[in-house]
Each structure stands twice: as structure tokens, then as C-alpha cells.
Interface confidence: low
């Protein structure tokens, strides 16, 4: 019988032992700082921890706060070790404190939507407030148990760094309540109150019978008029006005986790569900030389589309990347910031019956208070985890 | 201090038409969803129709499907109500209210069904 | 439609008395519930909303409490100022539905 350990498949100093109950033939045991079936993978060193299961360590946004991990595929915990929740109610259900779950379908398979106790009126049941929550606020890190109106979403930690994404809609209304829960509420669907989730958009959905079509078409640089409606996605942009030049139009720098080996899968993944999420056309931008604006992140490009400003007591692993992404990178997964080129011209009060936010700050709420109630999580290939919305600039005049 | 006042009511035979009008004061009108709800005499509640804060959705209730109409103008600050082909069934006290819990009615308008 | 069903329709007690009234949804309406106050001849006065929130001004004898498809309003101690007609009412879904009423008075 052939040993699966002959061939050493362990890397990094690995120890393989073999196993019949394995997909392999073999199980390795990784040392510290690796991990993957065969060590392969480098576990990011995070502070005084490792980002397992493919996480990526991120410094914090806050001088002063320790690194952090992004964490995939579900996994959480300060060192991504924490399992995925199964999806729906569970068990164990995603319902604090005496919370009673109802499942919901969606997008992203099943959902939950949670029937609280007054005492605790985070989407998931959260105590907003309660013991050990002050010191977390804010720290860039999503503490569910702590996320909810009062405690302005972990001090945003838990909405894309927007303390209150439902600013400006009457909160007796409690319109965060009843965001995207599958039911039209029509006193939520009005702008500031973002549209209730777009629940009552009817047909909520492509149809069937296009949804493939328009997958399969969507930003080809072709206009699939069957697709161009707000719930295939506009087409992913290709039926926009030619009026203006795009590379100037408005956009989103997104900042998000992804796995390089399928980056482009995961680029139009992003991008199409985005579009049938936030019923725009979006799509990958290009710049002047056909690139994609995909840039790792830290990194100083990345971070100037981000527009924020860097922690200088953060050292850079490797030299700044200033050109957009290569694919030679095979790490397992990493930071990247994606621009975004929106069209909004379906949007606004000239276009009534096409509902959406019409400028990108409105989008980025939209998107923050998706993160905020855990609608944006399932349907994205990687963690969100900021957005910087661009209204888009005239382009420069030409220098003679 | 909020206020909401109905006007428009009266006597009206069946088959015919009114137009309910109310007006608010003391708050962002255009912030809030606004409804008609009404009161048979000596019966119940029932939620007639309601409206988004801008007036792009409105919602009725099955009795009163394709005979009345809600709509508001928020650059006056006015609720409407237009109702079409009474029956007796629709006479009622109608008020105008503020939410979906209403923390807020008009004092309410009369509107009598007869030949 | 969801269906609110009150009970009792009507009750007498005496004052200082502590009354409940409950409502029952056909199906889960979370906690999206409110309570009125109508005193003949007057508007309906809303009392409590998201099932246990008491609206600004309402006295803290009446509260409310339940979730899911079972619903109380209590008056801690009746007075003769509470002698009226009370509704519930769901916001879950539309369309919003009330109770039928549960006429209180003083024995």
C-alpha cells in the first residue's frame, strides 16, 4: 500500500500523517505561522496572534489599536478560528437574548430575521451598551453583541465605519428594524430611509430565465436591452448614456478581501451582485492603460483610492505597490482596493419608477446599512470592509 | 407642537365623490409616511390608505381599492384623500395620522353616505 | 390579512384595580405592536408602541409587553380617567390591522 506521506507533501517543517478519513489521504500539522492542506499558506502574523483559514491581517484604522483580522468564509474570532454559523436559525441560533428566529430566503441562500425583546433591539437581539462594549467601539473590528442604534453600529465597526446609516429617517420609525426583512413597509421606503431595503421593489428579482443570460452578458461592453432593468443589474453599466466620459463619472473604491488564484471570478462576482443589490449599474474600472484598478492593499495606491490617510506607526511589509495588481501573487487570500465605476443615471427624482440611490454617498449608507443588519456579508465573495464613494470630478483640461 | 387638521368632509349620496384634505404643521412633513384611517359609528379602527414620506409608494386597503386615491404635496404640507363611487359602507369619522404607530391624528372629518 | 383579536371586548373594575387586556395575532408579528386609548367621542390616543415602548406623556401605569403573536396591555392600577374604549394594532405587514376594542369601565 502506497504511504501518502512518501512524497513529503508538507511544507514550512510541516508533520504529515496519514489518514483515511481525509479528502487527501493525509492530514499536515502546520506550524506556527502556516497553514492550508499542505502548510503552504502563510497564517499572517497579526500582533500577538495568526490570522487562520486564510485570513488577511489588516492594521488598524486607529492609531494606537492593535492589527486585526479580516476573516473568511465565516470564520471569525480575534484569530479566525471561531467556525462559520450555519446559515438560517441554526442551531445554534444567531438570535440573542431570547430572540425567536424566522428564516428568510435571499441572494446569498438562507437568511434569519430575528423577533426581539425590547431590551435588546440589535438585528441579531444585541445589548448595545452592555458590559464590555465601551472599549470596543470603534476599534475597526465588528463586535456583534455590541452592534446596534445605540452604540452607532460598534461605532461603525459594524457599518463600514458610518456610525448611522439611517441618519435623517425618523427612528421612531425604527426603519433599521425592518430593513431588507423581505416585507415592503412603505413608511421606511423613502430615500433617507433607504428605500426599506428595496422590499418593496417589485419584481424583487431578474427572472429566471434571464438571470443566466444576463450573468453570462453582464459588462461585456455590449447593451443587452433584456437586461438593462434595475433587477438584472443595468446590464452591469453597458446600456449607460455615452454623454459623459466614465473614467470621470462617479465611483466607488471598495476595500475587500479576496482570493488572488480566482481573483477575476471573484472581481465579476463582486460586481454583479452588487449591481442586483443595489440596483445600479457597477462594474470593474479600467485605467487609461486597460487595467483593472484592483490594488493590493496596505499598500499606498490602494490606500490613496480609499482616501484615508495612513497609520504611520504601521510599517509596510513589502514596498509600496503603485501599479494595479498582477496576477502573480498566489498567497491565499489578501486585501485589495477595487474602483468602481457606478451609473447612476437610471437613479433619481427624473427616473421615479427606477428607485435607487442616486449619488454615491447614498450608496455607501445603502451598503453600510446592508453590513450593518449582516445582509452583506453572505452575498459577497470576501469580506467588506470599507467603501469610499467618489461623486466624480470633470476631467482635467488638456495641457498644451 | 404637531398638528393635523382634516377638512372636506360632509354629506354625499352614494355614487358620489369628496376630496379629503389634511393639513399638517409642526414638523418635517416630508420625513414622515401619512395615513387615512377611519372609524364607522360605534365600530372599529380600520386602516384606509397610506402614503411614503415621497409619496412614491401608497398602499389601500382592499375595500377601497380603485375608488379612492391617496396623495400628499409636500410643498404644501397636505394630505389627500379623493374618494369615488361611495357606499353606504364608507360612511365613518376619517382621520389622517402620522406613522405606523400613530402617535399622531387629526381631529377627524365626517363623512356621511346617503340618498 | 393578520388578524387581531382582542379580549375581553369589555370588562368593569374598580379603581385602583390592576386590568389586563390581551391581543392575539394570527401570525408573528415581531414586536411590531401598538396600543390606543379612545375615550368616547375623542381621537384615539396612541399609548404604547413596539409592544412595551410607552409614548411621551403616557402615565408609567399602563405597559405593555409580548412578542410574536401574544400581546398585553396592563393598567397597574385602574383610575377613572382610564374609563375608555382600547384597541391593538400590528405594523408587522400590511395591512395594518387593529383589534376590535376592549371597552373598559368602572364598576
Known amino acids: 500500500e502506497i504511504d501518502p506521506c512518501h512524497s513529503q507533501p508538507c511544507f514550512h517543517g510541516g508533520t504529515c500523517e496519514a489518514t483515511a478519513g481525509s479528502p487527501l489521504g493525509f492530514i499536515c500539522h502546520c506550524p506556527k505561522g502556516f497553514e492550508g492542506p499542505t502548510c503552504s499558506h502563510r497564517a499572517p502574523s497579526c500582533g500577538f496572534h495568526h490570522c487562520h483559514h486564510g485570513g488577511l491581517c489588516l492594521p488598524s484604522p486607529k492609531p494606537g489599536f492593535p492589527p486585526r483580522c479580516a476573516c473568511l468564509s465565516g470564520y471569525g474570532g480575534p484569530d479566525c478560528l471561531t467556525p462559520p454559523a450555519p446559515k438560517g436559525c441554526g442551531p445554534p441560533s444567531p438570535c440573542l437574548y431570547n430572540g425567536s428566529c424566522s428564516e428568510t430566503t435571499g441572494l446569498g441562500g438562507p437568511g434569519f430575521r430575528c423577533s426581539c425583546p425590547h431590551s435588546s433591539p440589535g438585528p441579531r437581539c444585541q445589548k448595545p451598551g452592555a458590559k464590555g462594549c465601551e472599549g470596543r467601539s470603534g476599534d475597526g473590528a465588528c463586535d456583534a453583541g455590541c452592534s446596534g442604534p445605540g452604540g452607532n453600529w460598534d461605532g461603525g465597526d459594524c457599518s463600514l465605519g458610518v456610525p448611522d446609516p439611517w441618519k435623517g429617517c425618523p427612528s421612531h420609525s425604527r426603519c433599521w428594524l425592518l430593513f431588507r426583512d423581505g416585507q415592503c413597509h412603505p413608511q421606511c421606503d423613502s430615500e433617507e430611509c433607504l428605500f426599506d431595503g428595496y422590499d418593496c421593489e417589485t419584481p424583487p428579482a431578474c427572472t429566471p430565465a434571464y438571470d443566466q443570460y444576463c450573468h453570462d452578458h453582464f459588462h461585456n461592453g455590449h447593451c443587452e436591452k433584456g437586461c438593462n432593468t434595475a433587477e438584472c443589474g443595468w446590464d452591469g453599466g453597458d446600456c449607460r448614456p455615452e454623454d459623459g466620459d466614465p473614467e470621470w463619472g462617479p465611483s466607488l473604491a471598495l476595500l475587500v478581501v479576496l482570493s488572488p488564484p480566482a481573483l477575476d471570478q471573484q472581481l465579476f462576482a463582486l460586481a454583479r451582485v452588487l449591481s442586483l443589490t443595489l440596483r445600479v449599474g457597477l462594474w470593474v474600472r479600467k485605467d487609461r492603460d486597460g487595467r483593472d484598478m484592483v490594488y493590493p492593499y496596505p499598500g499606498a495606491r490602494a490606500e490613496e483610492k480609499l482616501g484615508g490617510t495612513r497609520d504611520p506607526t504601521y510599517q509596510e511589509r513589502a514596498a509600496p505597490q503603485t501599479q494595479p495588481l498582477g496576477k502573480e501573487t498566489d498567497s491565499l487570500s489578501a486585501g485589495f482596493v477595487v474602483v468602481m465605476g457606478v451609473d447612476l443615471s437610471r437613479c433619481g427624482p427624473d427616473h421615479p419608477a427606477s428607485r435607487c440611490p442616486w449619488d454615491p454617498g447614498l450608496l455607501l449608507r445603502f451598503l453600510a446599512a446592508m453590513a450593518a443588519v449582516g445582509a452583506l456579508e453572505p452575498l459577497l465573495p470576501g469580506p467588506l470592509l470599507a467603501v469610499h464613494p467618489h461623486a466624480g470630478t470633470a476631467p482635467p483640461a488638456n495641457q498644451l | 407642537e404637531v398638528q393635523l387638521v382634516e377638512s372636506g368632509g360632509g354629506l354625499v349620496q352614494p355614487g358620489g365623490s369628496l376630496r379629503l384634505s389634511c393639513a399638517a404643521s409642526g414638523f418635517t412633513f416630508s420625513s414622515y409616511g401619512m395615513s387615512w384611517v377611519r372609524q364607522a359609528p360605534g365600530k372599529g379602527l380600520e386602516l384606509v390608505s397610506t402614503?411614503?414620506?415621497?409619496?412614491?409608494?401608497?398602499y389601500y386597503a382592499n375595500s377601497v381599492k380603485g375608488r379612492f386615491t391617496i396623495s400628499r404635496d409636500n410643498s404644501k404640507n397636505t394630505l389627500y384623500l379623493q374618494m369615488g363611487s361611495l357606499r353606504a359602507e364608507d360612511m365613518a369619522v376619517y382621520y389622517c395620522?402620522?406613522?405606523?404607530?400613530?402617535?399622531?391624528w387629526g381631529q377627524g372629518t365626517l363623512v356621511t353616505v346617503s340618498s | 390579512d393578520i388578524q387581531m383579536t382582542q379580549s375581553p371586548s369589555s370588562l368593569s373594575a374598580s379603581v385602583g384595580d390592576r386590568v389586563t387586556i390581551t391581543c392575539k395575532a394570527s401570525?408573528?408579528?415581531?414586536?411590531?405592536v401598538a396600543w390606543y386609548q379612545q375615550k368616547p367621542g375623542k381621537v384615539p390616543k396612541l399609548l404604547i408602541y413596539?409592544?412595551?415602548t410607552r409614548h411621551t406623556g403616557v402615565p408609567s401605569r399602563f405597559s405593555g409587553s409580548g412578542s410574536g403573536t401574544d400581546f398585553t396591555l396592563t393598567i397597574s392600577s385602574l383610575q377613572p380617567e382610564d374609563v375608555a374604549t382600547y384597541f391593538c394594532?400590528?405594523?408587522?405587514?400590511?395591512?395594518?390591522?387593529f383589534g376590535q376594542g376592549t371597552k373598559v369601565e368602572i364598576k
Open positions: 401570525q408573528d408579528v415581531g414586536t411590531a
Open positions: 402614503i411614503n414620506s415621497n409619496g412614491g409608494r401608497t
Open positions: 413596539w409592544a412595551s
Open positions: 394594532q400590528q405594523y408587522s405587514s400590511y395591512p395594518w390591522t
Open positions: 395620522a402620522r406613522d405606523q404607530g400613530f402617535a399622531y
